[in-house]
């Protein structure tokens, strides 16, 4: 992936739009489209006052770990959907899109250097609090977490990283 592709705001906006679309679709299904089990996802709540003050390395850790956990969660929901006859096939399309989107975003962030920043300097990783997580038991909640993660931590982090790269 070209190193700074994600710095074009339209790129991230496309994934955000897809996530919101999926969230809206699943809002309409019974019980929010139950997954039948609790899937661990990152807590997307952010204290923005604090976020602005804390180190870029710490942000990188949160974003990288969050992305990895979301990818795992989406893959798990993909497997659960494949084995379920209850859920409409159209949902599979949204989950597949999200899985593919998370792969692309991981590549784009790797190209931007988030992975390096997340592991060096070592103090950044060690000072970062363990990733806070919540449980998602419906597709609706999973897509809401996905959407909020992209609109929150990921957008904030890429904004910072892209500005740093401009200097």
């Amino acid at each position: 992936a070209p190193a700074r592709l994600i710095c074009d705001s339209r790129v991230l906006e496309r994934y955000i739009l897809e996530a919101k679309e999926a969230e809206n679709v699943t809002m309409g299904c019974a019980e929010g489209c139950s997954l039948g089990e609790n899937i661990t996802v990152p807590d997307t709540k952010v204290n923005f006052h604090h976020w602005k003050k804390s180190e870029a390395g710490r942000h990188a850790v949160e974003v990288w770990q969050g992305l990895a956990l979301l990818s795992e969660a989406m893959l798990r929901s993909q497997a659960l959907l494949a084995n379920s006859s209850q859920l409409p096939e159209t949902l599979q399309v949204h989950v597949d899109k999200a899985v593919s989107g998370l792969r692309s975003l991981t590549s784009l962030l790797r190209a931007l250097g988030v992975q390096k920043e997340a592991v060096s300097p070592p103090e950044a990783a060690s000072s970062a609090a363990p990733l806070r997580t919540v449980a998602a038991d419906t597709l609706c909640k999973l897509f809401r977490i996905y959407s909020n993660f992209l609109r929150g931590k990921l957008k904030l982090y890429t904004g910072e990283a892209c500005r740093r790269g401009d200097r």
Partner: antibody, heavy 116, light 109 residues
Framework: QVQLVQSGAEVKKPGASVKVSCKAS????????MSWVRQAPGQGLEWMGW????????NYAQKFQGRVTMTRDTSISTAYMELSRLRSEDTAVYYC?????????WGQGTLVTVSS | SYELTQPLSVSVALGQTARITCSGD??????VYWYQQKPGQAPVLVIY???KRPSGIPERFSGSNSGNTATLTISRAQAGDEADYYC???????????FGGGTKLTVLG
């Protein structure tokens, strides 16, 4: 002790500009973002924007974009908020507020009256 | 843009429990902050990160947040709690802070 001291009350004509200052003391000025919040008489709080005193970068509420400018002078630990093209609806108390884990320290407020 | 809605006023009898709500789309997914403002004074924070109290704020003040509603609860209300209360959160799409319209709390008796 930690405090923010703002400039005095101002009376302005519609169409004019006003520049309010906020002098910080008792802490490292460049270590905390500064926000500006206003409150019209008898109305609620309205966030206007923030400035990072270290780098000078800003983020303004959509409503004020194009009319507000936030600056700082690190040598005297002072933040400024300038609002241009004033109208009567801009009559309000303007507060600067330091951002810690939240808006933890507030200035005493500056009343800006816009009247012809 | 993101909007937070509060009731204009809430009344509570002295010593009873007051609940002030703050509604916003999926606000349960965000941190919420609550400020108390008395006439002629600057606001003072009473709750941050939805349910944390800064030092100096009595335990009578607590916060919760779920779905589309955040709530500030003031137990054993005192005359000194009479004030305007504002909730505050964040607009994810514009990266800006947002305040609710404010609620006037009246303590009766």
């Amino acid at each position: 002790q930690v405090q923010l001291v703002q400039s005095g009350a101002e009376v302005k004509k519609p169409g004019a500009s006003v520049k309010v200052s906020c002098k910080a003391s008792g802490y490292t000025f460049t270590s905390y973002y500064m926000s500006w919040v206003r409150q019209a008489p008898g109305q609620g709080l309205e966030w206007m924007g923030w400035i990072n005193p270290l780098k000078g970068n800003t983020n303004y509420a959509q409503k004020f974009q194009g009319r507000v400018t936030m600056t700082r002078d690190t040598s005297i630990s002072t933040a400024y908020m300038e609002l241009s093209r004033l109208r009567s609806e801009d009559t309000a108390v303007y507060y600067c507020a330091r951002e810690g884990m939240y808006f933890d320290i507030w200035g005493q407020g500056t009343l800006v009256t816009v009247s012809s | 843009s993101y909007e937070l809605t509060q009731p204009l006023s809430v009344s509570v009898a002295l010593g009873q429990t007051a609940r002030i709500t703050c509604s916003g789309d999926s606000i349960g997914d965000k941190y919420v902050y609550w400020y108390q403002q008395k006439p002629g004074q600057a606001p003072v924070l009473v709750i941050y990160d939805t349910n944390k109290r800064p030092s100096g704020i009595p335990e009578r003040f607590s916060g919760s947040n779920s779905g589309n509603t955040a709530t500030l609860t003031i137990s054993r209300a005192q005359a000194g709690d009479e004030a305007d209360y504002y909730c505050q959160s964040w607009d994810l799409d514009f990266n800006t802070y947002v305040f609710g319209g404010g609620t006037k709390l009246t303590v009766l008796g």
